[in-house]
C-alpha cells in the first residue's frame, strides 16, 4: 500500500500557502485528485510528488495515491481544505445525473472543516428542499439525496454561515432519470379496420415512455410511412403519435400496418388489418345448430353473430309462430360487440313454457340490405299416459294413449295383485310394443301415440299397466279390472271408476 | 452593457390576460436566473417570479401562483411572463431583473412596463 | 404586511449624512441572509446600490455604505447631494415565506 506524506489524513492551508504531497510505493505511483489549476507533478520512480505554491478553494479535495501494479489495489488518500474565508465551497460539478432511487451526491466540497455545523442544503436562491427529501453531508464529498425521486430534479445550493452570514455555492442541477423498464408502451387504433372503397380512414399509431428518447414509426406492408409526429407530455409520460389519414381509400390502401416503437430498453410492436371492399356487407350466421330442442320449463339463448359494414341501422328478434302472435321480450335481448364489424346478439328464452315453441327469426339491417337468421325450437316433454278398456271387433282391448316428446316408446306389463306400479317381483308378462300407432305428429306439439294391447279375459286379481318413455323420462298408467267393472289407477292418484 | 427592455403591458379588464415580454442584451442570458418584479402605482417593490437559466426551476410569489406563468426562450435572449384571469389588484408596472445566485439580490433592472387591470 | 421595515421617509441638508434602517427577524436578516439595497430615482427603475450588506457595485460613489448586525441593517450616506433624492428599498430573503422580500421604501428629501 502507499504511503501518503504529510502521513495525516486531511490538511488545512490558506489561500496563496504552498502545498507539497509525496506519495511512495513499491512501484511506480499515481495521483488522482480534482480537476483544479495550479498543480505540477513530479514522478522518480516509485515516488511521486504533486506541489502548488499557490493554493486556492480549487484545490479543495480528497487527494488519491494508487499502485497501478498492486494485484490488492491498495490506495492511500489525504483530503486538502484550502480555507478561502469569502469561499467555503468548492463545487466539483454543476449537474449531477443519475436514475431514480440512487443517491445523488452533490458535489459541494466544504473549503473550511470549521463550518461544517452550518452548513445546510437549498433549492435555488434558498428555498426550502421538497418535503421527504432525505439527505446527509460529508465535508469531503457534499451532500447526499438519499434514493432521489423524478420530482427531485432540481437546482440546488449549499449553504454556510460564515460569521454569521449565509454563503452560497454556485448552483448545482441535479437531473433524476425515470428507469425505463422497457420498451415504450403502444397502441394502434383501429385494432382492425375496414372501409368501402372510396371512403376516408384514419389509423393512429401512439407511443409512450417515461423517458423522451425513443423513436415511432408506422408502416404498411413493410414499407416505412412518412407522417408527421405530434409530441406531448402528461402523466409524467412522453408521447409520440403518427397519423395516417387517408381521403379516398383504393384497394392498394388494404393490408397489415405496423406500430413500430423503440429505445435503448429495445422495441415494442402491434399490428393491425385493414380491408378494403367494393360494396356494404352483412353476414349472420350462428355456432348453434338452427334446429333446437329442449326440454319443457328450461331455459335456451339463441345466439347470433353478425359481421357487418357499415353498421348496423336496425336489429329484431321475431316469433314467427304456430302458437301465439307474443313477441321475445326487448328485456331478454341482448347485444355484445366482439370488435368494431363483429357483434353477438342473444335472445335469452327462461323456463320455457308449451307455447313458446316455434321458429324464431333475427333480422338484421345494414346498407347492403336485409339478412335474416332463423331458428327452430322444438320443446321435450315426459310422456303423459292414459289407459282406457274397450271393444274393438268384439274383441276386450286396453287401448293406452301416450303423449310426449320425442315419441314416447310402449311397453304393457301384466302382473299380480292390485298395485298402482308393477315392481319386478310381482310382473307375470311384458309385451314391448316397437310400432305404436300415431295418432298426431305435427311440427313444434307432442307426437301422441296409440298402443292396443288384446286380452281375452281379464284376470281380476291382476293389474295391467301401460308405461311409455322417452329421452325426457317416462310415464305409466295402471288398470286394474274388478268384478263390477274395470277400474283405472294413473300414477299417484286414486280408483276412479270411469 | 447589460440591457433589459419590457414590453406588453398595457390595459385589460379584469379576468383577461396579456404578455410581458424582456428582451435581454450585454451579458449571456442563458447564464443566468432571471426575475420579475412588480411595484403598484404609489406603492413599493414586490417580488413576482422566478427562473432558473434553463428553465428547471421555477417559482412564484403566492399572490400570483396558478395565473401566472413564466418562462424563457434562451435562444431569442427574452424572458416572459403570461398573465392571466388578471383582478385589479395585479395593476403595477412590471419589471424584469437579472439575479444573482450568490446573494439573492438582483444586479440589473429593465425600466418597466405598466399594466392596468381596469373595467 | 411588509416583512422588512423601514422609516417613510428621511431628510438631510446638502453635505450632511443621514442613516436608512431596515428591521427584519430571525427569519430573514436575523438568519443570516444578505440585505440589499436599491435605489430609485424619481420615474426610473431600481437600481442596485449596495449588495450582500455593505458591497458597493462599480459605479456607486463610496459616499453610499451599508452595514447589518443582528435583525437589523442600515444604509448610510454622506456628502448627501441633491441628485441623492429618491427612494430607497432594502431587500433580503425570507425563510418563512420561502420568498425574496422588500422593505415599504424610505424617501430621502435633500432640503
Known amino acids: 500500500i502507499p504511503v501518503i506524506e504529510p502521513s495525516v489524513p486531511e490538511l488545512v492551508v490558506k489561500p496563496g500557502a504552498t502545498v507539497t504531497l509525496r506519495c511512495v510505493g513499491n512501484g511506480s505511483v499515481e495521483w488522482d485528485g480534482p480537476p483544479s489549476p495550479h498543480w505540477t507533478l513530479y514522478s522518480d520512480g516509485s515516488s511521486s510528488i504533486l506541489s502548488t505554491n499557490n493554493a486556492t478553494f480549487q484545490n479543495t479535495g480528497t487527494y488519491r495515491c494508487t499502485e497501478p501494479g498492486d494485484p490488492l489495489g491498495g490506495s492511500a488518500a489525504i483530503h486538502l481544505y484550502v480555507k478561502d474565508p469569502a469561499r467555503p465551497w468548492n463545487v466539483l460539478a454543476q449537474e449531477v445525473v443519475v436514475f431514480e432511487d440512487q443517491d445523488a451526491l452533490l458535489p459541494c466540497l466544504l473549503t473550511d472543516p470549521v463550518l461544517e455545523a452550518g452548513v445546510s442544503l437549498v433549492r435555488v436562491r434558498g428555498r426550502p428542499l421538497m418535503r421527504h427529501t432525505n439527505y446527509s453531508f460529508s465535508p469531503w464529498h457534499g451532500f447526499t439525496i438519499h434514493r432521489a425521486k423524478f420530482i427531485q430534479s432540481q437546482d440546488y445550493q449549499c449553504s454556510a454561515l460564515m460569521g454569521g452570514r449565509k454563503v452560497m455555492s454556485i448552483s448545482i442541477r441535479l437531473k433524476v432519470q425515470k428507469v425505463i423498464p422497457g420498451p415504450p408502451a403502444l397502441t394502434l387504433v383501429p385494432a382492425e379496420l375496414v372501409r368501402i372503397r372510396g371512403e376516408a380512414a384514419q389509423i393512429v399509431c401512439s407511443a409512450s415512455s417515461v423517458d423522451v428518447n425513443f423513436d415511432v414509426f408506422l408502416q404498411h406492408n413493410n414499407t416505412k410511412l412518412a407522417i408527421p409526429q405530434q409530441s406531448d407530455f402528461h402523466n409524467n409520460r412522453y408521447q409520440k403519435v403518427l397519423t395516417l389519414n387517408l381521403d379516398q381509400v383504393d384497394f392498394q390502401h388494404a393490408g397489415n400496418y405496423s406500430c413500430v416503437a423503440s429505445n435503448v430498453q429495445g422495441k415494442h410492436s402491434t399490428s393491425m388489418f385493414f380491408r378494403v371492399v367494393e360494396s356494404a356487407y352483412l353476414n349472420l350466421s350462428s355456432e348453434q345448430n338452427l334446429i333446437q330442442e329442449v326440454t319443457v320449463g328450461e331455459g335456451l339463448n339463441l345466439k347470433v353473430m353478425v359481421e357487418a359494414y357499415p353498421g348496423l341501422q336496425g336489429f329484431n328478434w321475431t316469433y314467427l309462430g304456430p302458437f301465439s302472435d307474443h313477441q321475445p321480450e326487448p328485456k331478454l335481448a341482448n347485444a355484445t360487440t366482439k370488435d368494431t364489424y363483429r357483434h353477438t346478439f342473444t335472445l335469452s328464452l327462461p323456463r320455457l313454457k308449451p307455447s313458446e315453441a316455434g321458429r324464431y327469426s333475427f333480422l338484421a339491417r345494414n346498407p347492403g340490405g336485409w339478412r335474416a337468421l332463423t331458428f327452430e325450437l322444438t320443446l321435450r316433454y315426459p310422456p303423459e299416459v292414459s289407459v282406457i278398456w274397450t271393444f274393438i271387433n268384439g274383441s276386450g282391448t286396453l287401448l293406452c294413449a301416450a303423449s310426449g316428446y320425442p315419441q314416447p316408446n310402449v311397453t304393457w306389463l301384466q302382473c299380480s295383485g292390485h298395485t298402482d306400479r308393477c315392481d319386478e317381483a310381482q310382473v307375470l308378462q311384458v309385451w314391448d310394443d316397437p310400432y305404436p300407432e300415431v295418432l298426431s305428429q305435427e311440427p313444434f306439439h307432442k307426437v301422441t301415440v296409440q298402443s292396443l294391447l288384446t286380452v281375452e279375459t281379464l284376470e281380476h286379481n291382476q293389474t295391467y299397466e301401460c308405461r311409455a318413455h322417452n329421452s325426457v323420462g317416462s310415464g305409466s298408467w295402471a288398470f286394474i279390472p274388478i268384478s263390477a267393472g274395470a277400474h283405472t289407477h294413473p300414477p299417484d292418484e286414486f280408483l276412479f271408476t270411469p | 452593457e447589460v440591457q433589459l427592455v419590457e414590453s406588453g403591458g398595457g390595459l385589460v379588464q379584469p379576468g383577461g390576460s396579456l404578455r410581458l415580454s424582456c428582451a435581454a442584451s450585454?451579458?449571456?442570458?442563458?447564464?443566468?436566473?432571471m426575475n420579475w418584479i412588480r411595484q403598484a402605482p404609489g406603492k413599493g417593490l414586490e417580488w413576482v417570479s422566478y427562473?432558473?437559466?434553463?428553465?428547471?426551476?421555477?417559482y412564484y410569489a403566492d399572490a400570483v401562483k396558478g395565473r401566472f406563468t413564466i418562462s424563457r426562450d434562451n435562444a431569442r435572449n427574452s424572458l416572459y411572463l403570461q398573465m392571466n384571469s388578471l383582478r385589479a389588484e395585479d395593476t403595477a408596472v412590471y419589471y424584469c431583473?437579472?439575479?444573482?445566485?450568490?446573494?439573492?439580490?438582483?444586479?440589473?433592472w429593465g425600466q418597466g412596463t405598466l399594466v392596468t387591470v381596469s373595467s | 404586511q411588509l416583512v422588512l421595515t423601514q422609516p417613510p421617509s428621511v431628510s438631510g441638508a446638502p453635505g450632511q449624512r443621514v442613516t436608512i434602517s431596515c428591521t427584519g427577524s430571525s427569519s430573514n436578516i436575523g438568519a443570516g441572509y444578505d440585505v440589499h439595497w436599491y435605489q430609485q430615482l424619481p420615474g426610473t427603475a431600481p437600481k442596485l446600490l449596495i449588495y450582500?450588506?455593505?458591497n458597493r457595485p462599480s459605479g456607486v460613489p463610496d459616499r453610499f455604505s451599508g452595514s447589518k448586525s443582528g435583525t437589523s441593517a442600515s444604509l448610510a450616506i454622506t456628502g448627501l447631494q441633491a441628485e441623492d433624492e429618491a427612494d430607497y428599498y432594502c431587500q433580503s430573503y425570507d425563510s418563512s415565506l420561502s420568498e425574496e422580500v422588500f422593505g415599504g421604501g424610505t424617501k430621502l428629501t435633500v432640503l
Open positions: 450582500g450588506n455593505s
Open positions: 431583473a437579472r439575479g444573482v445566485e450568490s446573494d439573492f439580490s438582483f444586479d440589473y
Open positions: 427562473i432558473s437559466s434553463r428553465s428547471s426551476t421555477i
Open positions: 450585454g451579458f449571456t442570458f442563458s447564464n443566468d436566473e
